[in-house]
Amino acid sequence: APVPPGEDSKDVAAPHRQPLTSSERIDKQIRYILDGISALRKETCNKSNMCESSKEALAENNLNLPKMAEKDGCFQSGFNEETCLVKIITGLLEFEVYLEYLQNRFESSEEQARAVQMSTKVLIQFLQKKAKNLDAITTPDPTTNASLLTKLQAQNQWLQDMTTHLILRSFKEFLQSSLRALRQM
């Protein structure tokens, strides 16, 4: 697994650097998770041909993965910091069940999958400190999540591979959209 943010060789080599601001820490955390996703995607793509699947075929899959839309206030047009932040946190909370699903899906990158899951929890905490309107954040229902997890794990091998690929691809896109929006805040 990669070294967590704040412990990379650059930091070791530069002990007199200014401590990271809240925004820099969040940015670095997202970049760290993206590195993890990249490693997991490599294993997935080496194992199956899912990465070559067309978007049209993938779109038929009925996974309800969080996605950024213009109404969420994270795009340049209609940008709204608070609405956007709520969307990012809510989306990450919704992704947690899917990240749990990924935990037993990797052989050589098991540690990496755990690192992505744990780093996402840390990112959520960072963002919750930044949010003013925590009441607007809806936490997914544990019972619904549990039954979703059971359903996903009961799929045949091909569908499980497809699900894994879709989760990684969607999570990467969601994080990139979040990174872009957070840099405006």
Epitope: R31, L34, S38, K172, S177
Partner: antibody, heavy 119, light 107 residues
Framework: QVTLKESGPALVKPTQTLTLTCTFS??????????VSWIRQPPGKALEWLAL???????RYNPSLRSRLTITKDTSKNQVVLTMTNMDPVDTATYYC??????????????WGQGTLVT | DIVMTQSPATLSVTPGDRVSLSCRAS??????LHWYQQKSHESPRLLIK???QSISGIPSRFSGSGSGSDFTLSINSVEPEDVGVYYC?????????FGAGTKLELK
């Protein structure tokens, strides 16, 4: 391989609207992390970034030219279009489109078109 | 806007020289700094991304260093084909901005 090519009028009259098209191949502008930018360079001068469009249709503009610029994409045609209204002689420049693609959105422009000179 | 200041404006070199080109940002841009080379009548070409990451197809004599707001592009042993203008670019915040360039010429 990745290629980008700009097309549009070589000559534009003052107050007219300039429409430039960037036609690309070798990548998809639906891939997350993918962006296309427009940059211009007046003769003998430095580069000036104008606008950028993301894979998901979000956009960014240079504030100094914001009111005059519109960037759009047509994914099916692999094209990005830039329109610039109210052209002036000072807008004479070579206009480039360029791609950036990385996980972290660092906006390093790794592939450029050949440029089109607009007078 | 983040202002990128490059120095010197012109650099006259002899083939084989080791040269350093400087770029300073008006505020910290972390490692969101890229270098381009533009030869006469050609499009710019990405040389180095994110301060020091090498680009496929770019000769190893080109290297980058720095952090925060001070950056350097080094050419280990200048070749005649390295003549051109070198630009640094801020990729940290919008608008994306370029330096005015350093012109590398042969003595």
């Amino acid at each position: 391989q990745v290629t980008l090519k700009e097309s549009g009028p070589a000559l534009v009259k003052p107050t007219q609207t300039l429409t430039l098209t960037c036609t690309f191949s070798g990548f998809s502008l639906t891939t997350s992390g993918m962006c296309v930018s427009w940059i211009r360079q007046p003769p003998g001068k430095a580069l000036e970034w104008l606008a950028l469009i993301y894979w998901d249709d979000d956009k960014r503009y240079n504030p100094s030219l914001r009111s005059r610029l519109t960037i759009t994409k047509d994914t099916s045609k692999n094209q990005v279009v830039l329109t610039m209204t109210n052209m002036d002689p000072v807008d004479t420049a070579t206009y480039y489109c360029a791609r950036s693609y990385d996980d972290y959105l660092y906006y390093a422009l790794d592939y450029w078109g050949q440029g089109t000179l607009v007078t | 806007d983040i202002v990128m200041t490059q120095s010197p404006a012109t650099l006259s070199v002899t083939p084989g020289d080791r040269v350093s080109l400087s770029c300073r940002a008006s505020q910290s841009i972390s490692d969101y700094l890229h270098w381009y080379q533009q030869k006469s009548h050609e499009s710019p070409r990405l040389l180095i991304k994110s301060v020091s990451q090498s680009i496929s197809g770019i000769p190893s004599r080109f290297s980058g260093s720095g952090s925060g707001s001070d950056f350097t592009l080094s050419i280990n042993s200048v070749e005649p084909e390295d003549v051109g203008v070198y630009y640094c670019q801020n990729g940290h915040s919008f608008p994306l901005t370029f330096g005015a360039g350093t012109k590398l010429e042969l003595k």
